[in-house]
C-alpha cells in the first residue's frame, strides 16, 4: 500500500490556502473532482466539487472554497479564502470515477489556522481580494453520493507532526450539499 503523507500549512485567520492537486491528464482531465475534509473516526466529507464533466478553467465556488480545474496543466487548484480557526483539519483532493471508487490525489493537506495578525506593515491581503471575485456564471456543482461495500469507517490516524486537529466542527459559510463520500487508497 502507498504510504499516506501530509503537507502542513500553518496560516493565520483571514489568509488564503492555495494548493494544487496534480492528476494524470489522459485519465482524469474531464473527471469530476472534489475537495474533502477528514475528521477522526469519520468518513471523508466532501466540501466542494467540480461539475460533471469537469469544465476547463471554470471556477466553482462553495462558500469560501473555490475550485478551478486546469485541464491543460493537469491541475486542480483549490483555494480556501478568509480562513477561520475552525477550518483547521486534514484535507484531500479526490477524483470521482464511477463506477470505480474515488481516487485520492496525494498529498493530504494538514491545515492549521491560528488567530493573529498575518501581515507586515503595509501588507493587506484584503486589497488583493479581487483575485477571488468569481463571475456571475460560477456554478456550484452537485456532488455525487457513492456507496460501496468497502466503506471507510475509520479515518487514518492523526499526523505524527506536532499539530493536532481541533475537535470542533468545521464552519464554512454558505456550504451546502455537503455529503459523506468514502475514499479508498
Amino acid at each position: 500500500a502507498t504510504k499516506l503523507t501530509e503537507e502542513k500549512y500553518e496560516l493565520k485567520e483571514g489568509q488564503t490556502l492555495d494548493v494544487k492537486c496534480d492528476y494524470t491528464l489522459e485519465k482524469f482531465a474531464s473527471s469530476q473532482k472534489a475537495w474533502q475534509i477528514i475528521r477522526d473516526g469519520e468518513m471523508p466529507k466532501t466540501l466542494a466539487c467540480t461539475e460533471r464533466p469537469s469544465k476547463n478553467s471554470h471556477p466553482v465556488q462553495v462558500g469560501r472554497i473555490i475550485l478551478e480545474d486546469y485541464h491543460d496543466h493537469g491541475l486542480l487548484r483549490v483555494r480556501m479564502v478568509n480562513l477561520q480557526v475552525e477550518d483547521s483539519g486534514l484535507y484531500q483532493c479526490v477524483i470521482y470515477q464511477p463506477p470505480k471508487e474515488p481516487h485520492m490525489l496525494f498529498d493530504r493537506i494538514r491545515l492549521v489556522v491560528t488567530k493573529g495578525f498575518s501581515g507586515t506593515p503595509g501588507s493587506n491581503e484584503n486589497s488583493t481580494q479581487n483575485v477571488y471575485k468569481i463571475p456571475p456564471t460560477t456554478t456550484k456543482a452537485l456532488c455525487p453520493l457513492y456507496t460501496s461495500p468497502r466503506t471507510v469507517t475509520q479515518a487514518p490516524p492523526k499526523s505524527t507532526a506536532d499539530v493536532s486537529t481541533p475537535d470542533s466542527e468545521i464552519n464554512l459559510t454558505n456550504v451546502t450539499d455537503i455529503i459523506r463520500v468514502p475514499v479508498f487508497n
Epitope: L11, L25, T128
Partner: antibody
Framework: EVQLLESGGGLVQPGGSLRLSCAVS????????MSWVRQAPGKGLEWVSE????????YYADSVKGRFTISRDNSKNTLYLQMNSLRVEDTAIYYC????????????WGQGTLVTVSS | EIVMTQSPATLSVSPGERATLSCRAS??????LAWYQQKPGQAPRLLIY???TRATGIPARFSGSGSGTEFTLTISSLQSEDFAVYYC??????????FGQGTKVEIK
C-alpha cells in the same frame, strides 16, 4: 532519507550540448513535480524548468525555452535536462529540486552540478 | 512575470541580535511565498513556506509573516550558523517561479 544527486555537468563550447541527470531516492518519485534551478557564479537563484509528476506537464523559463528540454524516467527515478545551443550566460551550478505535492516550492535539493560554457 | 525584490542587499548583525529581512512582490501572491537559506558551497535549504509555515527541522527562531505583496523573515536571535544568504520565492500562479535577488546576513 531523501537524496538527489546531479551529474553530467562540465565544460562545453558555446552552441554545444549537455545532458544533466538527477538520480533520486527516498520518496515516490513519480508522484512529485521536479524542477531544475540554476545559480550563476556569485549570483542568485533562477528557476529553469519544471516537470509535473502525474500530469507530466512541462514548463520553462523564457531564457531557456526552445533550447532546453526537461524529462523524467519514473522507472529509473531519474530527472533529466537536455541542454542544446548553450550560451556563455548558461554557465551556472544546476540544482535539481523536489517540489511539494501541493505547490511549486522546493523542499529538497541536490548538491548541484557545474556547467561551464566557454570558448 | 512576478518580480521579487528583497531588502536590504546586505544586513550586518551581531550574534544574538534580531534580524529582519524583507521581500516584496510586484503583484499579490497571497500567502504563496517561501524562504530559503544558502550557505557558501551548499545547496539552498527550505526554511519557510506558505509565508509563515516552518519547514521540517527548522528552529523556532525563524519566523515568517506577511501576505499579498509584503513579506518578512525574522530571525529572533542570530546564531553563528545563521550567517548566510536568504532568498524568497513566489509560487503563486503558474511558472515562471521567481526568486528575490537575495539578502546576505553577515556578522557585524
Amino acid at each position: 532519507e531523501v537524496q538527489l544527486l546531479e551529474s553530467g555537468g562540465g565544460l562545453v563550447q558555446p552552441g554545444g550540448s549537455l545532458r544533466l541527470s538527477c538520480a533520486v531516492s527516498g520518496f515516490t518519485f513519480s508522484r512529485y513535480a521536479m524542477s531544475w534551478v540554476r545559480q550563476a557564479p556569485g549570483k542568485g537563484l533562477e528557476w529553469v524548468s519544471e516537470m509535473r509528476g502525474s500530469s507530466g506537464s512541462t514548463y520553462y523559463a523564457d531564457s531557456v525555452k526552445g533550447r532546453f528540454t526537461i524529462s523524467r524516467d519514473n522507472s529509473k527515478n531519474t530527472l533529466y535536462l537536455q541542454m542544446n545551443s548553450l550560451r556563455v550566460e548558461d554557465t551556472a551550478i544546476y540544482y535539481c529540486a523536489k517540489e511539494f505535492s501541493s505547490n511549486s516550492l522546493f523542499d529538497y535539493w541536490g548538491q548541484g552540478t557545474l556547467v561551464t560554457v566557454s570558448s | 512575470e512576478i518580480v521579487m525584490t528583497q531588502s536590504p542587499a546586505t544586513l550586518s548583525v551581531s550574534p544574538g541580535e534580531r534580524a529582519t529581512l524583507s521581500c516584496r512582490a510586484s503583484q499579490s501572491v497571497n500567502s504563496n511565498l517561501a524562504w530559503y537559506q544558502q550557505k557558501p558551497g551548499q545547496a539552498p535549504r527550505l526554511l519557510i513556506y506558505g509565508a509563515s509555515t516552518r519547514a521540517t527541522g527548522i528552529p523556532a527562531r525563524f519566523s515568517g509573516s506577511g501576505s499579498g505583496t509584503e513579506f518578512t523573515l525574522t530571525i529572533s536571535s542570530l546564531q553563528s550558523e545563521d550567517f548566510a544568504v536568504y532568498y524568497c520565492q513566489q509560487f503563486y500562479n503558474w511558472p515562471p517561479w521567481t526568486f528575490g535577488q537575495g539578502t546576505k546576513v553577515e556578522i557585524k
